[in-house]
């Protein structure tokens, strides 16, 4: 695609190329033969985040308490607001507009990967030799008791939801 | 003041092209676009496409892209203008204009005819 | 694209009379409205850009007005000369448009 009429960072408006506006800054009127453009610096709690002809700035986000949101990185006149959730709690997207309690993992669950402001907790089944007995949004599935080192033997198989239970050896009488 | 000077009179067959030269004065050329617009016999007024001398940018109207060709030489302030595979309603005025706020000065035309 | 339409197609006015001629966008074009006048065997010639900029050597005769799609050029007392076409142009969006023109004779 060959170049347009007018370079980067300039517009096309009645047959001349006028300059953008920077990031920060909201069209007031285009240039003409014998002026610049005119631009004005947005507002409090405003922003533009390119070189833009706009006539109004984005407000910024508000990160809404009541759905968990907290500021993660305040907004300037250039950037828009980043909201993240409450401990416990992460985005129901990637615009992070909600949050949600984390999930937890049921028993025979562990977690393999704990839960973030922006993902959830990730679970995974016990494999045999492990269990959780708990629904827990932090805990591993554990490794099943080792009867042997400590000179026990197994009395109840374990499952993905109990530990083995070891007892003494039988002894000959 | 300032100029613009349009080459003459064009007859064209059908599928031939034809090329138009439109010759600045008068003001920095490469200061100000360069628009194309034509006008058929009896009709109103239709934008081709504007040209940056400056450094050759374009913009054409989706009807006239593929078939038309806008340049500019700089060292003899001079646009043109090309319209390939001609048919029988291209046949019209063609003027060049220079930017500025509006068409600001205009050429004094140039008429291709196409005609088997 | 932008459609511009001007009325009436042809304006019949007296010497000295006033001239009031329209042209409307089929959308908003911020005020991005140039009038032109052709007349047989003469250059076009710009009499007003964005909407209301005289262009320079116009008489002040000539004077535009309007926002949004409506616009109104306005010859407040005609001259002999100024019997001839005139045609709207918006500079808002690509692709530049122009009206049909409205002829301005002599009653």
């Known amino acids: 695609e060959p170049p347009t009429a007018c370079r980067e960072k300039q517009y096309l408006i009645n047959s001349q190329c006028c300059s953008l506006c920077q990031p920060g800054q909201k069209l007031v009127s285009d240039c003409t033969e014998f002026t610049e453009t005119e631009c004005l610096p947005c507002g409090e709690s405003e922003f533009l985040d390119t070189w833009n002809r706009e006539t109004h700035c984005h407000q910024h986000k508000y990160c809404d308490p009541n759905l968990g949101l907290r500021v993660q990185q305040k907004g300037t006149s250039e950037t828009d607001t980043i909201c993240t959730c409450e401990e416990g709690w992460h985005c129901t997207s990637e615009a992070c507009e909600s949050c949600v309690l984390h999930r937890s993992c049921s028993p025979g669950f562990g977690v393999k990967q704990i839960a973030t402001g922006v993902s959830d907790t990730i679970c995974e089944p016990c494999p045999v030799g492990f269990f959780s007995n708990v629904s827990s949004a932090f805990e591993k599935c554990h490794p099943w008791t080792s009867c042997e080192t400590k000179d026990l033997v197994v009395q109840q198989a374990g499952t993905n939801k109990t530990d083995v239970v070891c007892g003494p050896q039988d002894r000959l009488r | 003041q300032v100029q613009l000077v349009q080459s003459g009179a064009e007859v064209k067959k059908p599928g031939a092209s034809v090329k138009v030269s439109c010759k600045a004065s008068?003001?920095?050329?490469?200061?100000?676009?360069i628009e194309w617009v034509r006008q058929a016999p009896g009709q109103g007024l239709e934008w081709i496409g504007v040209?940056?001398?400056?450094?050759?940018?374009?913009n054409y109207n989706e009807k006239f892209k593929g078939r038309a060709t806008l340049t500019a030489d700089k060292s003899i302030s001079t646009a043109y203008m090309e319209l390939s595979r001609l048919r029988s309603d291209d046949t019209a005025v063609y003027f060049c204009?220079?930017?500025?706020?509006?068409?600001?000065?205009w050429g004094q035309g140039t008429l291709v005819t196409v005609s088997s | 694209e932008i459609v511009m339409t001007q009325s009436p197609a042809t304006l019949s006015v007296s010497p000295g009379e006033r001239a009031t001629l329209s042209c409307r966008a089929s959308?908003?074009?911020?005020?991005?409205l140039n009038w032109y006048q052709q007349k047989p065997g003469q250059a076009v010639r710009l009499l007003i850009s964005s909407t209301s900029r005289l262009h320079s050597g116009i008489p002040a005769r000539f004077s535009g007005s309007g926002s949004g799609t409506e616009y109104t050029l306005t010859i407040s007392s005609l001259q002999s000369e100024d019997f001839a076409v005139y045609f709207c142009?918006?500079?808002?969006?690509?692709?530049?448009?122009f009206g049909q023109g409205t002829k301005v004779e002599i009653k």
């Open positions: 204009a220079r930017g500025g706020s509006g068409f600001a000065f």
């Open positions: 142009q918006q500079g808002n969006t690509l692709p530049w448009t």
């Open positions: 959308q908003d074009i911020s005020n991005h």
């Open positions: 008068g003001y920095g050329f490469t200061n100000y676009l």
């Open positions: 040209i940056n001398p400056g450094y050759g940018g374009v």
